[in-house]
Interface confidence: medium
């Protein structure tokens, strides 16, 4: 049985060229987190592991900024950037958390700015 | 070298708890956790639980929520494995396996030799 | 709960051919960097012995004639070529969640 829950930034928005932090957090559980890794739909952006550190996909790696702490940060948004993140946690002994956040990249300034964690 | 001691054999009544046993040596005995596996005769494996040896944390198969309790005597480096109303489908081979945490992969590297447990009048 | 799918359930062997045993998680169970899938051989009235550990990882001891791959959900193991001692049931089981389960078995016989 499984105690823990992830908390994310939910459903945000952001300018087109502009930057948003991507974070969850996972709580109620003393399971270790041995890595997380950040995905898109079926791609894989990073990997933060416990031991090794960070690991940015190489085709990824000029818009995508670690952390802070085991968030993500994605520069550079374009209208293709809108989708689901995911963010997965490894624990031992847990096995898998993951937690769900929708970005929408909008094309001017409509973005939502009141968006938790967001870059201004 | 890492041993996992069981007893070989236990008999209990059906409705009477029973508490197995598992006693390690040859290790670090709190830096793992140790997990119980119950195996019907002919069957496969069903994974009851596992408790860290140093702070007595568990995680259960919901399945064993209302029948399995496990403890630790970190005194006497034992784990127990207590088994609540007893029936004969809890007649069984029980194994105590210690699980080895590989980056978060974790397996199980050393098997204790299984408790016969028979639940009978 | 991941479900485990051993097959076969049976297997008969020649003595030094290939014996090739497959299963199939119900979810994947790997990552980028590890596949959390162990096998495990037992013998009558013995407890199971760790044979394979992250999907292709030979356990300290284990002879190389036991090897095994994959990734995702589809996982084989592979014992080539066959000796006797190698009679036996054979189990995956997976590390990935809480709570962990093993496939169903498959036994090989030597002939």
């Known amino acids: 049985m499984m105690t823990g829950t992830i908390e994310t930034t939910g459903n945000i928005s952001a300018e087109k060229g502009g930057s948003i932090i991507l974070q969850c957090h996972l709580s109620s559980t003393t399971a270790q987190v041995t890595q997380v890794n950040w995905e898109q739909q079926d791609q894989l952006l990073a990997i933060c592991n416990a031991d090794l550190g960070w690991h940015i996909s190489p085709s990824f790696k000029d818009r995508v900024a670690p952390g802070p702490g085991l968030g993500l940060t994605l520069q550079s948004l374009t209208v293709n950037d809108t989708g689901e993140y995911f963010c997965i946690y490894h624990t031992y002994p847990d096995g898998t958390y993951t937690g769900r956040i929708f970005l929408e990249v909008l094309e001017s300034s409509v973005a939502e700015h009141g968006a938790r964690f967001q870059i201004p | 070298q890492v041993q996992l001691q069981q007893p070989g054999a236990e008999l209990v009544r059906p409705g009477a708890s029973v508490k197995l046993s598992c006693k390690a040596s040859?290790?670090?005995?709190?830096?793992?956790?140790m997990n119980w596996v119950k195996q019907r005769p002919g069957q496969g494996h069903e994974w009851i639980g596992m408790i860290h040896l140093s702070n007595s944390e568990t995680r259960l198969n919901q399945n064993f929520l209302d029948k399995a309790t496990l403890t630790v005597d970190k005194s006497s480096s034992t784990v127990y494995l207590q088994l609540s109303s007893p029936t004969s489908e809890d007649s069984a081979v029980y194994y105590c396996?210690?699980?080895?945490?590989?980056?978060?992969?974790?397996?199980?590297?050393?098997w204790g030799q299984g408790t016969t447990l028979t639940v009978s009048s | 709960d991941i479900v485990m799918t051993q097959s076969p359930a049976s297997l008969v062997v020649s003595l030094g051919q290939r014996a090739t045993i497959s299963c199939r998680t119900s979810q994947s169970v790997s990552t980028s960097s590890y596949s959390y899938m162990h096998w495990y051989q037992q013998k009558p009235g013995q407890p199971p012995k760790l044979l394979i550990k992250n999907a292709s990882n030979l356990e300290s001891g284990v002879p190389a004639r036991f090897s095994a791959s994959g990734s995702g959900t589809d996982f084989t193991l592979n014992i080539h070529p066959v000796e006797e001692e190698d009679a036996a049931t054979y189990y995956c089981?997976?590390?990935?969640?809480?709570?962990?389960?093993f496939g169903g078995g498959t036994k090989l016989e030597i002939k």
């Open positions: 396996a210690r699980e080895r945490d590989y980056y978060g992969s974790s397996y199980f590297d050393y």
């Open positions: 040859g290790y670090s005995f709190t830096s793992y956790w």
């Open positions: 089981q997976h590390s990935w969640e809480i709570p962990r389960t």
